[in-house]
């Protein structure tokens, strides 16, 4: 019966005297007065079986001890680890000249597992074993014992098994543990290829070439090979396997991507979380499905988020000048998650009596810089008819607009050509500046050209450079602009509107908000 002891994964134990429960029962010659089996207590106060001999008073000792038959199990080279303790001859009184401090290790290959006698002539010598200078001190019961460990190897072996023998020539020695093992390169997975348990070669420099097989749910990229070295270590991995689409490497295996993850190709990448606005409902997904209302453009990679058409442009402003119109607007609040936003202009000519009866403007109208695919947020429309109502629609479009076009993506304005708009406002003043607000006032335009219906104030942070502006409308010639940021420079423009349309914006007024309240009376110049 053997107890379990833990050894390195690359060693396969054929014999371990420490694991045997009860007597070892090896064969000694002579039967009496030579090697003797003795129980000692180990560090856990458990009895262990050892063999000892201490015939140090007489010269010419020749005491043999032979193990039982040891199966080879296909190994061509085996290793013998001997843990022993040797008593110094000078610690024994009156034995100088007869006491030795070495013993000899022998082996004999045999197919017969029941040889009863020791025939010394059959055995081949492996080595003479001496106590090393370096030894381990171990607790045996309550004692500290100097334990030497020596390892020898023998091979190539060819028969079914073998016997080991220990020859004592007059030492005071105890064999505390004898372990016989061979080395293998243990089953392993490298680069997603599995390599089987492989017994090492016959000599200490041999390398055994082993071809690996791809693990489940993977495919060969290059033929996987490794070499099993004599010490039981795998060497020089060549080639590899890659996890299939929908699978990723985890602890040397290809695991299906979890729900909510995907992998599009056979690569060494991990599964990725489904991009925003998409999902997978099965394990092992190779792509993710877009959420309702979200889409992928034809040239979008599987790794890109699903996106949607943009919302309508904001703050559309028109400026009519006889038969020309300048339109200006802000980017949509929601770009749909895409960068490829552009704008299309739709021009409709409408009847004066019934504005709902509108027709396309036709090709006589010109657009600067262009009508469709605008990247800027302004356009000039020329060559319009005089005294005509026009409706202009500005459509925000992106790469997925075609999958779900909707009126929600446009903003429109209706204008009448050939009516004079008011002139620009000459003087804008900042009456009061606080941390969070600016009080503005201005004069009526020199040429109102009719009844002024309202004023429009456009403002933006100076460093935003008109990229993101806000509009405030008022019937009065003053207004409080609130919700500003402290210590920030703002630029303000004001224009008037009559039934004919908007006039031009005033010159810019630049104002910096305060940290403490103060009254600043503007004089038309920049106020800071």
């Amino acid at each position: 019966v053997t107890g379990s002891r833990v050894y390195p994964a690359n060693e396969v134990t054929l014999l371990d005297s420490r694991s045997v429960q009860g007597e070892l029962g090896w064969i000694a010659s002579p039967l009496e007065g030579g090697w003797e089996e003795v129980s000692i207590m180990d560090e856990k106060n458990t009895p262990i079986r050892t063999y000892q001999v201490c015939n140090v008073m007489e010269a010419s000792q020749n005491n043999w001890l032979r193990t039982d038959w040891i199966t080879r199990e296909g190994a061509q080279r085996v290793y013998i680890e001997i843990k022993f303790t040797l008593r110094d001859c000078n610690s024994l009184p009156g034995v100088m000249g007869t006491c030795k401090e070495t013993f000899n290790l022998y082996y004999y290959e045999s197919d017969n597992d029941k040889e009863r006698f020791i025939r010394e002539s059959q055995f081949g010598k492996i080595d003479t074993i001496a106590a090393d200078e370096s030894f381990t001190q171990v607790d045996i019961g309550d004692r500290i014992m100097k334990l030497n460990t020596e390892i020898r190897d023998v091979g190539p072996l060819s028969k079914k098994g073998f016997y080991l023998a220990f020859q004592d020539v007059g030492a005071c020695i105890a064999l505390v543990s004898v372990r016989v093992f061979y080395k293998k390169c243990p089953l392993t997975v490298r680069n997603l290829a599995q390599f089987p348990d492989t017994i090492t070669g016959a000599d200490t420099s041999s390398l055994v070439e082993v071809r690996g097989s791809c693990v489940n749910n993977s495919e060969e990229k290059d033929v996987p090979k490794m070499y099993c070295g004599a010490d039981g270590e795998w060497l020089v991995p060549i080639g590899n396997c890659l996890c299939n689409a929908g699978h990723e490497e985890q602890n040397g295996e290809c695991q299906a991507c979890k729900i909510g993850y995907y992998k599009a190709l056979s690569t060494d990448a991990s599964c990725a979380k489904c991009p925003p606005h998409s999902y997978s409902v099965w394990e092992g997904a190779t792509s993710c499905t877009c959420d309702r209302g979200f889409f992928r453009a034809d040239n979008d990679a599987a790794s890109m988020p699903c996106t949607r058409p943009p919302s309508a442009p904001l703050n559309l402003i028109s400026n009519v000048n006889e038969t020309s119109v300048n339109l200006e607007w802000s980017s949509p609040q929601n770009t749909g998650g895409r960068q490829d936003i552009s704008y299309n202009v739709v021009c409709k000519k409408c009847g004066a009596g019934d504005p709902s009866k509108c027709r396309p403007c036709g090709s006589g109208v010109h657009y600067t810089p262009q009508q469709n695919g605008l990247k800027t947020t302004r356009v000039s429309i020329t060559d319009l008819l005089a005294h005509t109502n026009y409706t202009f629609e500005i459509w925000a479009v992106n790469g997925v607009s075609k999958y779900n076009p909707s009126p929600d993506q446009s903003v429109s304005v209706t204008v009448t050509t050939n009516q004079a708009a008011p002139s620009s406002i000459a003087l804008v003043q900042a009456k009061e500046v606080t941390r969070y607000s600016v009080a503005l006032a201005w004069l009526e335009p020199d040429r109102p050209n009719g009844v002024i219906l309202e004023y429009e104030v456009k403002y933006y942070e100076k460093d935003q450079n008109e990229r993101s502006y806000r509009i405030v409308r008022t019937a009065a010639r003053n207004t409080d602009i609130k919700g500003l940021n402290p210590l920030t420079s703002y630029v303000f423009h004001v224009r008037a509107r009559t039934a004919a349309g908007y006039g031009d914006f005033s010159e810019p007024l630049e104002v910096t908000t305060n940290t403490v309240p103060s009254r600043i009376i503007g004089d038309g110049a920049n106020s800071t």
Epitope: M41, C54, V56, M57, E58, D142, R143, A174
Partner: antibody, heavy 121, light 106 residues
């Protein structure tokens, strides 16, 4: 089997000598040292010393020098204890015991049956 | 000379009980200590050497431990044949015995 055979009881007068034999059998006599132990009536054990059976070299314990001599006759595998100038306090059982050296320690593993020496006028 | 002191002088136990005997050295003897059993009218018998190693044929109900100056012999379950006198003995340059502990039937 291994055994040590000692002679029967001896009665001696004070001032006399006695030679106690110890015959070994069942093992190679010269391969193990021989020790001598005394036990006075009703008392404990007292180690007297030992002799190297290979070289004949004796070692005596404190208090057992002078009148006590260890000797050998290897041809008949026998060790001897000789006591001269006997005194009444020498009355005791005298044991021979084979000395066992081992890696783990030493001990007297085989004992003779003992020889009672009585010193009385 | 190293003096060995054994205690108790007499130990009364019933068969099947555990017996623990002590031996203390006047100076360290490392693990160089043996235990012997002696029954009336018989020669001593080696039980333990090297402080804790069983001699040949000794049942495993006998066990021993210790090193340096303090040593213990334990009989886990005393059998009728275990009633005897037990001696400890140290072996250094010169050997000495303890005075003995008598284990008797309670």
């Amino acid at each position: 089997q291994v055994q040590l055979l000692q002679s029967g009881a001896e009665v001696k007068k004070p001032g006399a000598s006695v030679k106690v034999p110890c015959k070994a059998s069942g093992y190679t006599f010269t391969s193990r040292a021989m020790s001598w132990v005394r036990q006075a009536p009703g008392q404990g054990l007292e180690w007297m010393g030992w002799i190297n059976t290979n070289t004949g070299n004796p070692t005596y314990a404190q208090g057992f020098t002078g009148r006590f001599v260890f000797s050998l006759d290897t041809s008949v595998s026998t060790a001897y204890l000789q006591i001269s100038s006997l005194k009444a306090e020498d009355t005791a059982v005298y044991y021979c015991a084979r000395v066992r050296f081992t890696v783990y320690g030493d001990g007297m593993d085989v004992w003779g049956q003992g020889t009672l020496v009585t010193v009385s006028s | 000379e190293i003096v060995l002191t054994q205690s108790p002088a007499t130990l009364s136990v019933s068969p099947g009980e555990r017996a623990t005997l002590s031996c203390r050295a006047s100076q360290s003897v490392s693990s160089n200590l043996a235990w012997y059993q002696q029954k009336p009218g018989q020669a001593p018998r080696l039980l333990i050497y090297g402080a804790s190693t069983w001699a040949t044929g000794i049942p495993d109900r006998f066990s021993a431990s210790g090193s340096g100056t303090d040593f213990t012999l334990t009989i886990s379950r005393v059998e009728p044949e275990d009633f005897a006198v037990y001696y400890c003995q140290q072996y250094g340059p010169s050997w000495t015995f303890g005075q003995g502990t008598k284990v008797e039937i309670k």
